[in-house]
């Protein structure tokens, strides 16, 4: 089969570029999945943890933060492939010798049952069924999140 070499037409404004959005998000943007009061975006390539963290920021989002076991289960239910691992926003802080979320808070030991060691250069990944400690240099997929702004009913003073 003889193929001609063609040039590709590609989007001028790539979706990886930062976009300006109004503060406060009422609905999930296109391509994002809503999970309760969050919007999630699953990557289609692989990266070490640091690169994943940086790539989420280009989408004006962060690596996934998981509040509790319930949210973990709901997130895992969105994962369709059994053997695939995803980085989330949790890594081991050597100075504090504890698991630390990227928002600065520490892991409540009851929230996630982590398989693997808590040690230097360890980051947390999740699969369809489990939570793992992996070397942060491991190249796997990742999940970004944006918080939805809750819509509150406006209260008007009596006139």
């Amino acid at each position: 089969q003889k193929s001609s070499i063609e040039k590709c037409s590609v989007d001028i404004q790539q979706s990886r570029n930062k976009t300006t959005e109004r503060p406060g998000l009422l609905n999930c943007p296109i391509y994002w999945q809503q999970l309760r009061e969050k919007c999630l975006l699953f990557s289609h390539t692989v990266n070490p943890w640091n690169n994943s963290l940086a790539d989420c920021s280009t989408k004006e989002s962060s690596l996934l933060l998981i509040r509790d076991k319930d949210e973990l289960i709901h997130t895992q239910n969105l994962i369709r492939d059994k053997a695939i691992l995803f980085w989330i926003g949790l890594n081991f802080s050597l100075s504090e010798k504890n698991w630390k979320w990227i928002n600065g808070s520490f892991l409540n030991s009851n929230d996630l049952e982590i398989r693997g060691d808590a040690k230097e250069n360890s980051c947390i990944s999740i699969s369809q069924t489990s939570v793992y400690s992996e070397y942060c240099s491991t190249e796997i997929r990742w999940i970004c999140q944006k918080e939805l702004t809750p819509v509150r009913n406006k209260v008007y003073p009596d006139s």
Epitope: C8, S15, H44, T45, N47, P48, K59, E139
Partner: antibody, heavy 120, light 107 residues
Framework: QVQLVQSGAEVKKPGASVKVSCKAS????????MNWVRQAPGQGLEWMGL????????YYNQKFKDRVTMTRDTSISTAYMELSRLRSDDTAVYYC?????????????WGQGTTVTVSS | EIVMTQSPATLSVSPGERATLSCKAS??????VVWYQQKPGQAPRLLID???IRHTGIPARFSGSGSGTEFTLTISSLQSEDFAVYYC?????????FGGGTKVEIK
């Protein structure tokens, strides 16, 4: 202008290996994940795996996991796909294809294809 | 593995007529569906992503629709350059799979 140019046709014997190259131009090579897709004669398309040219990280279709190796040389903006222990049913056109977005699985640019014939 | 089934295998259409191509997924894939066009001796060319979003430079006569398991590519008025093979692909799972293709030929 974005372009992917692949190496020429190959004829191999069963059991041998083949290495196909894909040279990218017109964009930042390390900014987009490269995938490999093959098409057997008169058949549909089959996804083989991907490589992140920035880091060298790979993910392979389980079907090819034991036989395929994807690498890259960032200094010459080139991705490679090597398939070992070739069989007659590996006869196909092999395409490199650029992932258009880190968060969606579509291919917005394809190489012209490399025909690999496996015959004794 | 998600199986993508395209029908018909061959579609004979006259220039200027409408062509409707079908793609069915064996499981729900949401809207994570792509359509490509392939001409003889050429690589596939991206037409539509996310079931209905036309790629840059793709004429408005190409439109995609559907969600879940049933998807359609419509070419509203076939031009001579549209006679080709069309493939659908899903990326709802990380094992990307393609349909077997629909050949659109001149009637």
């Amino acid at each position: 202008q974005v372009q992917l140019v692949q190496s020429g046709a190959e004829v191999k014997k069963p059991g041998a290996s083949v290495k196909v190259s894909c040279k990218a131009s017109g964009y930042s090579f390390t900014g987009y994940t490269m995938n490999w897709v093959r098409q057997a004669p008169g058949q549909g398309l089959e996804w083989m795996g991907l490589i992140n040219p920035n880091t060298g990280g790979t993910y392979y279709n389980q079907k090819f996991k034991d036989r395929v190796t994807m690498t890259r040389d960032t200094s010459i903006s080139t991705a490679y796909m090597e398939l070992s222990r070739l069989r007659s049913d590996d006869t196909a056109v092999y395409y490199c294809a650029r992932l258009g977005d880190n968060y969606r699985g579509y291919f917005d640019c394809w190489g012209q294809g490399t025909t690999v014939t496996v015959s004794s | 593995e998600i199986v993508m089934t395209q029908s018909p295998a061959t579609l004979s259409v006259s220039p200027g007529e409408r062509a409707t191509l079908s793609c069915k997924a064996s499981q729900d894939v949401g809207t994570a569906v792509v359509w490509y066009q392939q001409k003889p001796g050429q690589a596939p060319r991206l037409l539509i992503d996310w079931a209905s979003i036309r790629h840059t430079g793709i004429p408005a006569r190409f439109s995609g629709s559907g969600s879940g398991t049933e998807f359609t590519l419509t070419i509203s008025s076939l031009q001579s350059e549209d006679f080709a093979v069309y493939y659908c692909q899903q990326y709802s799972t990380y094992l990307y799979t393609f349909g077997g293709g629909t050949k659109v030929e001149i009637k």
